[in-house]
């Protein structure tokens, strides 16, 4: 009998089984279909709650959650200050729109990441056109 699996009918590295009356393809992670021909969109039909965005990869989906939310589908409330986002000893305050950093003396920036030089100038990176150093960074 001809070995029908030798023709490699299963796509994307799927395992071929010759059942005699038909073939059966067993698909690798991230693929589906009778011949493993469908590349699964990991995020199809997988909603992330509370403004989270779906990130594909590895045959599974992962939610990248908006500030203040966590968990598999971003349904759990999370403390935005838990990760200690304020640098150089800045104090973190949870806010309805995210978090706010109150910087320690000598530092500035949304996350207190920039030291203020003794002459009063800041060590902000070069500003893009239309944005002055010291303007809030969006």
């Amino acid at each position: 009998r001809v070995d029908r699996c030798s023709l490699q009918p299963c796509r994307n590295g799927g395992l071929c089984l010759d059942l005699g009356h038909a073939l059966r393809c067993r698909c690798r992670a991230g693929f589906a279909g009778p011949r493993c021909e469908h590349d699964l969109d990991d995020c199809a039909g997988r909603a992330c709650a509370n403004g989270g965005t779906c990130v594909e990869g590895g045959g599974a989906h992962r939610c990248s959650c908006a500030l203040g939310f966590g968990g598999r589908d971003c349904r759990e409330r999370a403390d935005p200050c838990a990760a200690r986002p304020c640098a150089h000893g800045g104090r973190c305050y949870a806010h309805f729109s995210g978090l706010v950093c109150a910087c320690a003396p000598g530092y500035m920036g949304a996350r207190c990441e920039f030291p203020v030089h003794p002459d009063g100038a800041s060590a902000l990176p070069a500003a893009p056109p239309g944005l002055r150093p010291g303007d809030p960074q969006r």
Epitope: R4, G20, L23
Partner: antibody, heavy 128, light 112 residues
Framework: QEQLVESGGGLVQPGASLTLTCKAS????????MCWVRQAPGKGPEWIAC???????AYSASWAKGRFTVSKTSSTAVTLQVTGLTAADTATYFC??????????????????????WGPGTLVTVSS | DIVMTQTPASVEAAVGGTVTIKCQAS??????LAWYQQKPGQPPKLLMH???VLTSGVPSRFSGSGYGTEFTLTISDLECADAATYYC??????????????FGGGTEVVVK
């Protein structure tokens, strides 16, 4: 509307034989396997046997060989013959469709490995 | 023949909650896993195949994952209508040339 309907169940004596029938409507019988699955009261489903409609190939569970025979009787019906019934065969017997897929130029049909259409079932009670 | 083991046998959760059901195969089945929902007096209904592909008409509150021998069905935002018994199922092909199907023992989901 795609539909499967089983018939032939009822109360039977231990040691008796029985023939169950599954009638299909609303879809093309070809490129499908018609299967029998039973479910004892309070238990999970248990696969018995299938027949692939395109070439009549039948395959069954190892425990079912000998007592259970699946046959295609028309272009829209399959049967399950059961002999030597015992109380352990008391169950609801379901007819289920397992789809197969064909591709132009492909060497064969491809089994799906699942059941995407079920009948409502027919109850077989074996008791004296 | 393959053996499918489901856990837990029963789980209870509140409306709006999340339930996770696990299914373990006794051998590597790649992604060849289907999930069914069954309500009393009704036949099983296919929810998902190929481990994570939802059947048409099934709400996206149902999601499946896993590969190889470990699989999971997750039902989020539970509704009263989700109260049912859920079964996993795979097919097998033994070296002796026999092809067949095996079901898990089932998980009863009770919605409070």
């Amino acid at each position: 509307q795609e539909q499967l309907v089983e018939s032939g169940g009822g109360l039977v004596q231990p040691g008796a034989s029985l023939t169950l029938t599954c009638k299909a409507s609303g879809f093309d019988f070809t490129s499908n396997a018609m299967c029998w699955v039973r479910q004892a009261p309070g238990k999970g489903p248990e696969w018995i046997a299938c027949i692939y409609n395109d070439d009549g190939s039948a395959y069954s569970a190892s425990w079912a060989k000998g007592r259970f025979t699946v046959s295609k009787t028309s272009s829209t019906a399959v049967t399950l013959q059961v002999t030597g019934l015992t109380a352990a065969d008391t169950a609801t017997y379901f007819c289920a469709r397992s789809p197969y897929y064909t591709y132009g130029g492909a060497p064969s049909a491809y089994a799906s490995g699942y059941f995407n259409l079920w009948g409502p079932g027919t109850l077989v009670t074996v008791s004296s | 023949d393959i053996v499918m083991t489901q856990t837990p046998a029963s789980v209870e959760a509140a409306v709006g909650g999340t339930v996770t059901i696990k299914c373990q195969a006794s051998e590597n089945i790649y992604n060849s896993l289907a999930w069914y929902q069954q309500k009393p007096g009704q036949p099983p209904k296919l929810l998902m195949h190929d481990a994570s592909v939802l059947t048409s008409g099934v709400p996206s509150r149902f999601s499946g994952s896993g590969y190889g021998t470990e699989f999971t069905l997750t039902i989020s935002d539970l509704e009263c209508a989700d109260a049912a018994t859920y079964y996993c199922q795979s097919d097998y092909y033994s070296t002796g040339g026999s092809y067949g199907f095996a079901f898990g023992g089932g998980t009863e989901v009770v919605v409070k």
